[in-house]
């Protein structure tokens, strides 16, 4: 599998409609919780919780502050922590408790505390519960939590130093935790937790399971340096601990390695960054998407692997366990255990089969089963991804968070759309198209290029958004910017399953927002733009330039995958003279204007889609030289290189009208300007000319010129 290409389109922060929420002097907007039925987004930040309108997050509904007392701050600072940053209350747990309350925990100046937030009054109840084991002490430490039937399941650190990791269930009747032992958790960095409910038609009286995802220091691989390993762990909701062995500890805690690697190379992605569980009516078993980076990431690599939950469950239900053996100098080595395992199976949830054998609860389990799972929490079998390879591998980017939406294209094909955020405040939208990855677009969510800390996807039909939290605020973005595709070709070439071209309105529309039937809409996920209807020509605009001055002819081609080239009077613009230059990769600069520059200029684009090349006339300019008594100077046009486009400036190439496709562009010089051959100088005149540029607007003013199968390029 090759690296994913660059995003086809880059939307700058100012180019698209993004809604923002931030409050002065409030930072670290890292906890997001969506209540779809109330259309409310809850935001947990440093020392504050907000409720905002989920359809327009700039509309604040409620706010409540949870600040640390000066006394607590002082005590925290005495322990060597920063009073300005660390000794504050970072909200780390924001979970639904009931229809009218949220369960909220914060670091609370290294004395983690939890409270209930009443959603009617939007006030804390003042319970001030000990947050130890539910929330980290240190805002820099990893954490994850999920609320399951009123009980909080957490993965975090249990002490001030952060040296004792714990996966626990906070329950009044049956609190449970992991053993504090290296085989159970070895310096984990917690990433995600979620509950997977038993299927309603499950015949074997199965239990709900809670899955935890984390990266930890490997016990099974021995190298000079510490090897990190991504893990999936699982506990059973019905677990009540053991009677003597594993008393008040999980009897169902099992963990396995998550594999995400590129089989054809030595690329191993072993640091887990984020996980998203995809549930969809069409999915019998949930699929989870995991985002990874390699341990030694000096080149900025990221990967996404997708896993069937049934694969993980198979490993836990039928896989082999690992055993530890001590070798010289108290060194421990982990190897596969091939012998018989006790019955009932260690780590198994209590199902109807276990109940039939009189094991009605984990409290009834025989000591040998409990002792075995206590000693062997690690599975030897690994959880492998769907198709045994990553869905996406991207170079020169550090992805931070992922959400996935399953959507249906017009032709009925189902696509898993991956929304992946970066450490530079951008959001990539990607899909798998016939075993290749297509990054539809990149949107700069945060102007300051700060890392996205949290991503959330609304699942309500109709108004659907992605919410992103960072240190400075929250941004709300639609799932697609269909309306920004001004032509049918643009709309089709976007290959965005959310978008289709509507001929009657001549607009690119969002599929999930169209009430009307999809009949007549145009969407070709193959990118075949030949399905687009012919277009009428656009209107002209006039510009005036001073004789001897410079003209800039605009070519608004948003696609980063397209190569732009120019034609003049159906002739080839060759790349060797100071006469021409390129501005911002696409706009043509004509220097030292004279009558000989009059004529028709066409900006064309060439975009490779699968094994075809799409050519389009993007813009058409007519320059007329006219004598004017007094020259009018055109305003200077500044063109900014699009951030994130990551394509080198190309040299102009042209071809005769209707001839075979143009020759490939030559790389531009480091200045970004290009040079083309001089044309014969026109006969000079004593008066300064008026140059009128009759411009077809920067839309594709003609139908695709030709769609040609081309050789491997």
């Amino acid at each position: 599998m090759a690296f994913a290409p660059i995003p086809r389109i880059t939307w700058e922060h100012r180019e698209v409609h993004l809604v923002q929420f931030h409050e002065p002097d409030i930072y670290n907007y890292s906890a997001l919780l969506l209540s779809e039925d109330k259309d409310t987004l809850y935001i947990g930040a440093r020392e504050a919780v907000f409720a905002v309108n989920a359809l327009n997050i700039s509309e604040k509904q409620h706010e409540v502050y949870w600040k640390v007392s000066e006394d607590k701050k002082a005590k925290c600072a005495e322990k060597g922590k920063s009073k300005q940053t660390e000794c504050l209350n970072y909200i780390r747990v924001l979970q639904p408790l009931s229809a009218t309350s949220l369960y909220v925990c914060g670091t609370n100046a290294f004395q983690p505390a939890c409270d209930h937030l009443n959603l009617t009054s939007f006030k804390f109840l003042g319970k001030n519960e000990d947050g130890k084991g539910r929330c980290p002490f240190d805002p820099a430490h990893s954490y994850t939590s999920v609320m399951v039937d009123g009980e909080l399941y957490s993965g975090t650190s249990y002490n001030f130093l952060g040296s004792e990791p714990i996966i626990s269930r906070n329950s009044s009747h049956s609190p449970l935790r992991t053993e504090y032992a290296i085989p159970w958790l070895n310096e984990p960095s917690f990433v995600f937790a979620d509950v997977i409910r038993k299927s309603p038609d499950s015949p074997d009286g199965e239990d709900d399971r809670v899955y935890f995802f984390f990266t930890e220091v490997s016990v099974e691989y021995e190298f000079v340096f510490r090897v990190l390993i991504p893990r999936i762990a699982r506990v059973c909701k019905g677990d009540q601990g053991g009677l003597r062995t594993l008393q008040k500890k999980w009897t169902s805690f099992l963990k396995a390695r998550l594999i995400c690697s590129r089989p054809d190379s030595g690329l191993v992605f072993n640091v887990l960054r984020d996980v998203f569980v995809l549930r969809s009516p069409g999915l019998k078993v949930p699929v989870f998407y995991a985002l990874f980076t390699p341990q030694l990431n000096n080149v900025g690599l990221s990967a996404v692997c997708a896993y069937n939950l049934s694969t993980a469950e198979e490993v836990f239900s039928h896989g082999k366990y690992m055993q530890s053996t001590t070798v010289e100098q108290s060194h421990t080595k982990w190897v596969r255990y091939n012998g018989p395992v006790p019955k009932p199976r260690p780590g198994a949830c209590i199902d109807s089969e276990a109940r039939a054998a009189n094991y009605t609860s984990s409290l009834n389990l025989p000591d040998k089963t409990l002792q075995f799972v206590k000693d062997h929490p690690l599975m030897d079998d690994s959880v492998t991804p769907i198709d045994n390879r990553p869905r996406l591998i991207k170079k020169d980017v550090n992805y931070t968070q992922i959400v996935v939406d399953r959507t249906q294209a017009l032709d009925g094909t189902v696509y898993d759309v991956m929304f992946v955020s970066t450490d530079r405040g951008a959001l990539h939208k990607a899909i798998s198209l016939e075993h290749a990855v297509h990054i539809i677009e990149e949107t700069q969510l945060f102007q300051d290029f700060e890392p996205v800390q949290t991503l959330l996807l609304s699942s309500k039909k109709g108004n659907r958004f992605v919410y992103a939290g960072s240190n400075s605020g929250v941004v709300q973005a639609p799932l697609a910017f269909c309306g920004k595709h001004g032509t049918c070709e643009d709309c089709v070439l976007a290959r965005d399953p959310y978008c289709a071209w509507s001929p009657p309105t001549a607009t690119c529309v969002a599929l999930h927002q169209t009430e009307s039937p999809s009949r007549g809409l145009i969407q070709e996920m193959s990118g075949d733009a030949s399905v687009c209807p012919d277009k009428s020509k656009g209107s002209y605009r006039q510009h005036f330039f001073k004789h001897g001055g410079t003209a800039e002819l605009k070519c608004s081609q948003k696609s980063n995958l397209a190569r732009v080239f120019w034609k003049f009077q159906n002739g080839v613009l060759k790349a060797e003279s100071p006469k021409y230059g390129l501005m911002g990769r696409k706009n043509l600069l004509i220097f030292n204007l004279s009558e000989g520059d009059s004529g028709v200029y066409q900006c064309l684009s060439e975009e490779r889609v699968k094994n075809k090349t799409v050519f389009q006339v993007v813009a058409k300019h007519v320059l007329e030289v006219k004598v004017v008594p007094k020259p009018v100077v055109a305003p200077t046009l500044s063109v900014v290189q699009t951030e994130g486009s990551r394509i080198a400036t190309k040299v102009l190439v042209a071809s005769t009208q209707g001839s075979s496709p143009p020759t490939p562009a030559v790389q531009a010089t480091s200045s970004g300007a290009i040079t083309l051959p001089p044309k014969p100088a026109p006969t000079g005149t004593s008066c300064e000319p008026k140059i009128v540029i009759n411009t077809v607007p920067q839309l594709h003013s003609e139908k695709t010129m030709y769609l040609k199968s081309s050789d491997n390029r």
Epitope: Q323, T325, G339, P342, K343, A357, Q371
Partner: antibody, heavy 117, light 108 residues
Framework: EVQLQQSGAELVRPGASVKLSCTTS????????MYWVKQRPEQGLEWIAW????????EYASKFQGKATITADTSSNTVYLQLSNLTSEDTAVYFC??????????WGQGTLVTVSA | EIVLTQSPTTMAASPGEKITITCSAS???????LHWFQQKPRFSPKLLIY???NLASGVPARFSGSGSGTSYSLTIGTMEAEDVATYYC?????????FGTGTKLELK
């Protein structure tokens, strides 16, 4: 009370086969793993094979592959060991035993197999 | 396969004496799968110690076990006449399961 009752002693000719049985009481063999162990006269103990009667999964020591066959009948709570193509080397006491993570907790009384012309 | 070598092969001791039998594995094994058995003449083996150091049901407290990796030992705190038997260590860490060579304990 857990008991493992083995079949009686066998005197067999070289080249013949023999099938030993081990009937259990006090537990259901489906809930355990069952093993056979060999002890030649004045010698040590050798593990032959194990079976999981619940699913008939078996595992043999390589030296007993082709020589021994372990089977189970859950309806009668009985485990069997069939030994084929017998030679004087197969003269030994054969024990059935059960257990796993807690070691071989319960043992049968042993069955003496004598191979003689 | 894992070879378990016991020493001594034979030993004689007086009642009240402290006895230590060692079991050396050819490769490192998990202490969770090392067990000790006692076998008296014309009897089936009897489980004494399981998982290196756990006393089996009904076994007197004078018996104890320890060890890790490749080195394990069985100790009888104060020898009694009824302890005359052959003692075997056994590993279940790796297939095939193997027993030790045996140590015959006699009365002096």
């Amino acid at each position: 009370e857990v008991q493992l009752q083995q079949s009686g002693a066998e005197l067999v000719r070289p080249g013949a086969s023999v099938k030993l049985s081990c009937t259990t009481s006090g537990f259901n063999i489906k809930d355990e793993h069952m093993y056979w162990v060999k002890q030649r006269p004045e010698q040590g103990l050798e593990w032959i094979a194990w079976i999981d009667p619940e699913n008939d999964n078996t595992e043999y020591a390589s030296k007993f592959q082709g020589k021994a066959t372990i089977t189970a009948d859950t309806s009668s709570n009985t485990v069997y060991l069939q030994l084929s193509n017998l030679t004087s080397e197969d003269t030994a006491v054969y024990f059935c035993t059960t257990g796993d993570y807690d070691g071989f907790t319960y043992w049968g009384q042993g069955t003496l197999v004598t191979v003689s012309a | 396969e894992i070879v378990l070598t016991q020493s001594p092969t034979t030993m004689a001791a007086s009642p009240g004496e402290k006895i230590t039998i060692t079991c050396s594995a050819s490769s490192s094994i998990s202490s969770n799968f090392l067990h000790w058995f006692q076998q008296k003449p014309r009897f089936s083996p009897k489980l004494l110690i399981y998982r290196t150091s756990n006393l089996a049901s009904g076994v007197p407290a004078r018996f104890s076990g320890s060890g890790s990796g490749t080195s394990y030992s069985l100790t009888i705190g104060t020898m009694e006449a009824e302890d005359v038997a052959t003692y075997y260590c056994q590993q279940g860490s790796f297939m095939p399961f193997t027993f030790g060579t045996g140590t015959k304990l006699e009365l002096k």
